[in-house]
């Protein structure tokens, strides 16, 4: 039984892999930052997380997903205010009972740090120094991203 | 209430480089892009640039090569420098909050009052 | 660089009028993002219209946008004494940002 969380994160991931290819996005649009090899897109308005991971959608990208603690902390760096927290792309998984990511994959328990409970209805959130385990009904700003990439790709749920 | 000044020299003599300061009063600088427009007398709206909080930068091609925008986090204060003026640059520079793509609203929300700036010897 | 071209230049209106401001792009303009603008001699820009459509905090319910790719419109429903100013819209889907050349709406 999938939570309605879950769906509304398959349904988005479904409806984003229907294009089969894409031009490479060789440089950052406006308003996006370089960090890497991926394009940021940080909010300054709050919503939940399933309208996080919709609002990325429809701008052709997907919260955050963030590969290792060194991506993290890259990221963190960006994050000038201590207090601001963030949706990225994770969220607890009721029937595997395991944080998965929304491109489909588990987490690695060596990547993220988590304060907080692993529960029905938690998603994740970083701010500047941490990150947390937070209701997905919170109202927070989340981070969206584009892959950078200099060729033709196909388009995978994680790009 | 978020505000925004202007604050500079309203007199810049050909060749040299013209100054502007804009003061963010009553918010954070944070997560918005803080932009700098022009208008020459009885004309349009040209925009110069942004400044993103992280010190990340876009200027608009015509005036990149004399455009440097810069921000001080501490001060809540982003700068205006272009350089090499002539008569041609001599406008009403506006500093403006723009709430990018992301946000209850987009676009230049909040704008300075503006300052004339005349270039002549 | 997306060139935004205003039509008509001047708009001679009364009061109680409706106003339609014509706004095309050489290219279309990403996910509608499109502002209109406001100004009055002497002053700033105020902002009225963001995402093609969508009224800025404050702005009476007179005022409306709509329009997507290349195509947008500003509309005046009524005209108040208030309304005769310059108006200009702007994308900000594309680098560089860019204006139209404006529409002035006076009183005929």
């Known amino acids: 039984q999938k939570s309605s969380i879950e769906k509304c994160s398959v349904d988005i991931q479904q409806s984003r892999n229907k294009t089969t290819e894409r031009p490479g996005l060789l440089n950052c649009p406006i308003y996006w930052q370089q960090l890497r090899e991926k394009c940021l897109l940080f909010s300054h308005t709050v919503n939940p997380w399933n309208n996080s991971l919709a609002d990325c959608s429809t701008k052709e990208s997907s919260l955050l997903l963030i590969r290792d603690k060194d991506e993290l902390i890259h990221t963190q760096n960006l994050i000038r205010d201590k207090a601001i927290l963030f949706w990225i792309g994770l969220n607890f998984s009721l029937s595997e009972k395991n944080w998965k990511w929304i491109n489909g994959s588990f987490l690695n328990s060596n990547d993220l740090e988590i304060r907080g409970d692993a529960k029905e209805n938690s998603c994740i959130s970083i701010s500047q120094t941490s990150v947390y385990s937070e209701y997905c009904s919170t109202e927070i700003r989340w981070i969206c991203q584009k892959e950078l990439t200099p060729v033709r790709n196909k388009v995978y749920p994680d790009s | 209430q978020v505000q925004l000044q202007e604050s500079g020299p309203g007199l810049v003599k050909p060749s040299e480089t013209l100054s502007l300061s804009c003061t963010v009063s009553?918010?954070?600088?944070?997560?918005?892009?803080w932009t700098w427009i022009r208008q020459p007398p009885g004309k349009g709206l040209e925009w110069i640039g942004y400044i993103y909080h992280s010190g990340s930068t876009n200027y608009n091609p015509s005036l990149k090569s004399r455009v440097t925008i810069s921000v001080d986090t501490s001060k809540n204060q982003f700068s205006l420098k272009l350089s090499s003026v002539t008569a041609a640059d001599t406008a009403v520079y506006y500093c403006?909050?723009?709430?990018?793509?992301?946000?209850?609203?987009?676009?230049?929300?909040?704008w300075g009052q503006g300052t004339m700036v005349t270039v002549s010897s | 660089e997306i060139v935004l071209t205003q039509s008509p230049g001047t708009l001679s209106l009364s009061p109680g009028e409706r106003a339609t401001l014509s706004c095309r792009a050489s290219?279309?303009?990403?996910?509608?993002?499109l502002a209109w603008y406001q100004q009055k001699p002497g002053q700033a820009p105020r902002l009225l219209i963001y995402?093609?459509?969508s009224r800025a905090t404050g702005i009476p319910d007179r005022f409306s946008g709509s329009g997507s790719g290349t195509d947008f419109t500003l509309t005046i429903s009524r005209l108040e004494p208030e309304d005769f100013a310059v108006y200009y819209c702007q994308q900000y889907g594309s680098s560089p940002l860019t204006f139209g050349g404006g529409t002035k709406v006076e009183i005929k």
């Open positions: 403006a909050r723009d709430g990018g793509i992301v946000g209850a609203t987009n676009a230049f929300d909040i």
């Open positions: 009553g918010g954070s600088i944070s997560f918005y892009y």
């Open positions: 290219q279309s303009v990403t996910s509608s993002y």
């Open positions: 995402g093609a459509s």
